[in-house]
């Protein structure tokens, strides 16, 4: 790393070493040899996150409802807006600036992991076994139903997106 | 009251590296910049870079970059200063010097040291 | 870097007298700037400030002035205790430099 001319949470400016505004705070003039550096506090929906020396407060984020958006956390004067999706949608990306309809996963494949407000539905085929005869963003691949407990016997077999059709046992005449 | 105490005088051949401990007492460690700073024979002082105990952060002089490492273990209250690759030219007692406390200054860098360590005398020689 | 440059490097004086030392500086550093004492031996010791704020502890004799490139320090009235090498340190922006030191000889 570079050497630095000044303190941590100071920066260099006429060949001096200046005070920079804490969060939430923008920079209005900077120091001179008399004065501390001037800053002042941001305005309603408006934040900065670090240390800085930035004249401009940056606005918070606006969680279009027209995109599927709402407001998860909502922004101070040191933190942005974090804004979510609707109930059955989720972010397109880490900024979450717009929202996409869950994935539901088709017939021979179930869920895996249900979507959440960032990501989406993660789906996996059915094994052998397992089955799901829907397209659901919910539903987990179903186990086989299995006719022997039932004191019965399979007639047609399973797919990955058909049960086992059970039936009665053939009785010895 | 205030005390830095350093470890002892080492005796290194020219290539190997040194450790010099720093341990403070009396005071909040965290609550103020460690700076090191040497003294070679019939030299005057030169300041070698600083460690903010806080943060773990330091600012090393362009001519030691590269060569010297400063950490800290704030369980104990001790600074460190690590210079490798020793020449006979790094003949010289080391100090740890305490600087004024984080907040204090809002202008200019303002390191004034008003405590010292003992220091320790490094010889390099083959 | 800046420049930190000390007249003279040596003075000869005797107990009583006034003894001025003078530091200049590359390019300005407004008014931080410091002096220490180091005896043989010794770490230095911080006596002035901010060019002329009196560490706590330091006797009144030791005074300090200027802001800029030019500072002084002033010792009023020499005492057997003050024979030593003193240095000046810019505290504008790192690096840190300090002025090559003045030695207060006995004459």
């Known amino acids: 790393e570079p050497p630095t001319a000044c303190r941590e949470k100071q920066y260099l400016i006429n060949s001096q070493c200046c005070s920079l505004c804490q969060p939430g705070q923008k920079l209005v003039s900077d120091c001179t040899e008399f004065t501390e550096t001037e800053c002042l506090p941001c305005g309603e929906s408006e934040f900065l996150d670090t240390w800085n020396r930035e004249t401009h407060c940056h606005q918070h984020k606006y969680c279009d409802p027209n995109l599927g958006l709402r407001v998860q956390q909502k922004g101070t004067s040191e933190t942005d807006t974090i804004c979510t999706c609707e109930e059955g949608w989720h972010c397109t990306s880490e900024a979450c600036e717009s929202c996409v309809l869950h994935r539901s996963c088709s017939p021979g494949f179930g869920v895996k992991q249900i979507a959440t407000g960032v990501s989406d539905t993660i789906c996996e085929p059915c094994p052998v076994g397992f089955f799901s005869n829907v397209s659901s963003a919910f539903e987990k691949c179903h186990p086989w139903t299995s006719c022997e407990t039932k004191d019965l016997v399979v007639q047609q077999a399973g797919t990955n997106k058909t049960d086992v059709v059970c039936g009665p046992q053939d009785r010895l005449r | 009251q205030v005390q830095l105490v350093q470890s002892g005088a080492e005796v290194k051949k020219p290539g190997a590296s040194v450790k010099v401990s720093c341990k403070a007492s009396?005071?909040?460690?965290?609550?103020?910049?460690m700076h090191w700073v040497r003294k070679a024979p019939g030299q005057g002082l030169e300041w070698m870079g600083w460690?903010?105990?806080?943060?773990?952060?330091?600012n090393y002089a362009q001519k030691f970059q590269g060569r010297v490492t400063m950490t800290r273990d704030t369980s104990i209250s001790t600074a460190y200063m690590e210079l490798n690759r020793l020449r006979s030219d790094d003949t010289a007692v080391y100090y740890c010097?305490?600087?004024?406390?984080?907040?204090?200054?809002?202008?200019?860098?303002?390191?004034?040291?008003?405590?010292w360590g003992q220091g320790t005398l490094v010889t390099v020689s083959s | 870097d800046i420049q930190m440059t000390q007249s003279p490097s040596s003075v000869s004086a005797s107990v009583g007298d006034r003894v001025t030392i003078t530091c200049r500086a590359s390019?300005?550093?407004?008014?931080?700037l410091a002096w220490y004492q180091e005896k043989p031996g010794k770490a230095p010791n911080l006596l002035i400030y901010?060019?002329?704020t009196l560490q706590s502890g330091v006797p009144s004799r030791f005074s300090g002035s200027g802001s800029g490139t030019d500072f002084t320090l002033t010792i009023s009235s020499l005492q057997p205790e003050d024979f030593a090498t003193y240095y000046c340190?810019?505290?504008?922006?790192?690096?840190?430099?300090f002025g090559g030191g003045t030695k207060v000889e006995i004459k």
């Open positions: 010097a305490r600087d004024q406390p984080l907040g204090y200054c809002t202008n200019g860098v303002c390191s004034y040291f008003d405590y």
């Open positions: 009396g005071y909040t460690f965290t609550g103020y910049y």
């Open positions: 460690i903010n105990p806080d943060s773990g952060g330091t």
């Open positions: 390019q300005g550093i407004y008014s931080w």
């Open positions: 901010t060019a002329s």
């Open positions: 340190q810019q505290a504008n922006i790192f690096p840190l430099t």
